[in-house]
């Protein structure tokens, strides 16, 4: 069974998938469509790297542009380095600027909804 066939079988169960499962899926050429990606748990999507999301979505990655202001895409963009987002060539904006450090202050992030940044 190839990645696409596997994805069709598990698609309806993905809404509650944890990050680890999504990372594993990204290695299987599943080409997840944007509607499915948008239904994933935000907390499961946030830790994914740009490279992992690119592999997870495959040719559908360009669809991130259309959904850049919707959750969970918007929240995921805010967590990525702008340099990494730029590698997608989609013009996605709102990533962490070059030279900034991301402090994983869980309590502050939980309160504010965005990571804490330290400038250069």
């Amino acid at each position: 069974m190839n990645g696409s066939e596997y994805f069709v079988k598990i698609q309806s169960f993905l809404g509650g998938a944890p990050t680890e499962d999504l990372k594993a899926l990204s290695q299987q050429n599943v080409s997840m469509d944007l509607a499915t990606f948008m239904k994933l748990r935000t907390d499961a999507v946030l830790p994914l790297t740009v490279a992992e999301v690119q592999k997870l979505l495959g040719p559908h990655v360009e669809g991130l542009k259309a959904e850049e202001r919707h959750r969970p895409v918007r929240d995921w963009i805010l967590r990525q380095r702008q340099d990494d987002l730029d590698t997608l060539g989609l013009g996605l904006q709102g990533g962490i600027p070059n030279g900034y450090l991301v402090l994983d202050l869980s309590m502050q992030e939980a309160l504010s909804g965005t990571p804490c940044l330290l400038g250069p």
């Epitope: 944007l34 509607a35 948008m38 360009e62 669809g63 542009k65 259309a66 919707h70 013009g91």
Partner: antibody, heavy 119, light 108 residues
Amino acid sequence: EVQLQQSGPELVKPGASVKIPCKASGYTITDYNMDWVKQSRGKSLEWIGDVFPYNGDSIYNQKFEGRATLTVDKYSSTAYMELRGLTSEDTAVYFCARRKTGTGYFDVWGTGTTVTVSS
Amino acid sequence: QLVLTQSPAIMSASPGEKVTLTCSASSSVSSTYLSWYLQKPGSSPKLWIYSTSNLASGVPARFSGSGSGTSYSLTISSMEAEDAASYFCHQWSSYPYTFGGGTKLEIK
């Protein structure tokens, strides 16, 4: 057959609100975005905003932010646009339009609802 | 916001004539993010062309779309009476999504 059915014409007074329904059929409403577009008489089209029905997340054209609210009742497969504080400038035809998630084009349009604001 | 300017605003063409409608953007738009809609009086708009050059389902092959950057066009190779309508270009490259002012195409 995929269809978006909207309600009939509305005549409302200045300052009042209107809530326009858009009933989706022939597909699963939570699998697509729903956008709303305004067309003033004899004029072009203006994007109001869109909602992702699965989680109700909505985004708006800044021009309509604060006055428009987009919602969805998943169980009746109906999207709604509420517009508040109406003025004569809001007299127009309002369309709902289905947008395949991950694209920016509208592949199915509603029948349109004419809203006339007049005292 | 990104402004789309369509020209001409109104034009008429004879049956069999080649017709070109243009859409000019105030800043560059990726070809993926440009589409065209057709609208007849009293009706809802219909998706006609998406991603600059892809014909929507049911659109006759006499229609084509092309362009890049700030300049896009819709061409009808041989005008037919049923092509008389208003045509709107649309971009989703930047928020808010915007539409051109439209070109009303009439049959002579």
